[in-house]
Amino acid sequence: NFMYSKTVKRLSKLREYQQYHPSLTCVMEGKDIEDWSCCPTPWTSFQSSCYFISTGMQSWTKSQKNCSVMGADLVVINTREEQDFIIQNLKRNSSYFLGLSDPGGRRHWQWVDQTPYNENVTFWHSGEPNNLDERCAIINFRSSEEWGWNDIHCHVPQKSICKMKKIYI
């Protein structure tokens, strides 16, 4: 009876997500059969988040809209470990929008989810950011410095990375 009500709850939760994500990949977390964490298929998972590399080329605003339609945001990178995970799935000859922008062109960078911008946990390429006109951030590969961030014009289409919290059922 307990298992039955738990299953019903899970199914109704899954139905919530079905609109955007017809298929979820779930893994059992820990030893407890009741704790499952899921990411939409074919998103990848790292710690408590799911990630999707969008290969469609769009402006920053459209890229963020595209993520939000899927219940996500453009990626907010909080640690070096998280960036190291993300770059495993990126192509070296491409650039990808991050959820980081400077809306007023004042060098006041902000994350889309309002996570405080911490200068000590940023991975800008050397000499970046460097232009008041370039109000959006991308991650790209430079042979001299590997992967890092660069500021660019927000209206120039790029690929992007979406991030959402894992779905717990």
Partner: antibody, heavy 118, light 107 residues
Framework: QVQLQQSGAEVVKPGASVKISCKGS????????MHWVKQAHAKSLEWIGV????????NYNQKFKGKVTMTVDKSSSTAYMELSRLTSDDTAVYYC???????????WGQGTLVTVSS | DIQMTQSTSSLSASLGDRVTITCQAS??????LNWYQQKPDGTVKLLIY???RLHTGVPSRFSGSGSGTDYSLTISNLDQEDIATYYC?????????FGGGTKLEIK
Amino acid sequence: QVQLQQSGAEVVKPGASVKISCKGSGYTFTDYSMHWVKQAHAKSLEWIGVISTYYGDSNYNQKFKGKVTMTVDKSSSTAYMELSRLTSDDTAVYYCARNGNFYVMDYWGQGTLVTVSS
Amino acid sequence: DIQMTQSTSSLSASLGDRVTITCQASQDISNYLNWYQQKPDGTVKLLIYYTSRLHTGVPSRFSGSGSGTDYSLTISNLDQEDIATYYCQQGNTLPWTFGGGTKLEIK
């Protein structure tokens, strides 16, 4: 080649307003913000502010807030700066300058002399 | 606001000399230091940006160096056409600010 052509010298009365222009050519106008810089006679350069030619928003030096209004006309690739409630302290050469990488002003107009005199 | 100080307001040198103009910021400006040349007719040109990078078309006799709060512009082989006033400018923090200028004259 990049060129910034400013409007001609102006003589204006105290309390009046003046609007000077800066027409950009030889590049994509909306890709580069426009800065304005003041130089009073025999004095150093003073940064007034910058306007985004793409978004139309401005960042002003606090010292010039209320004195200066910057605008842009994308269709004619022209930036404007209006100075209001003029006093003798506003007598100066005003330069427009294009925004560049590494927080720099990479190309400058020839300057517009504004003389405030009764 | 960040204060920019050019301690020498005027400098006299001979043609062919090596001339160094200095600029000090009131706080670390992370190499966002630019140098401009203003000719006697009022024309302003960018010479050097980001401490040491030469702007397009600028002769290689101009060079820049420095870090933190202390920066300098060097003209290695002074030419008649270098007679001008030189300004440093920091772009690290808004509002951008300029030094007082150094006027270069020929002996």
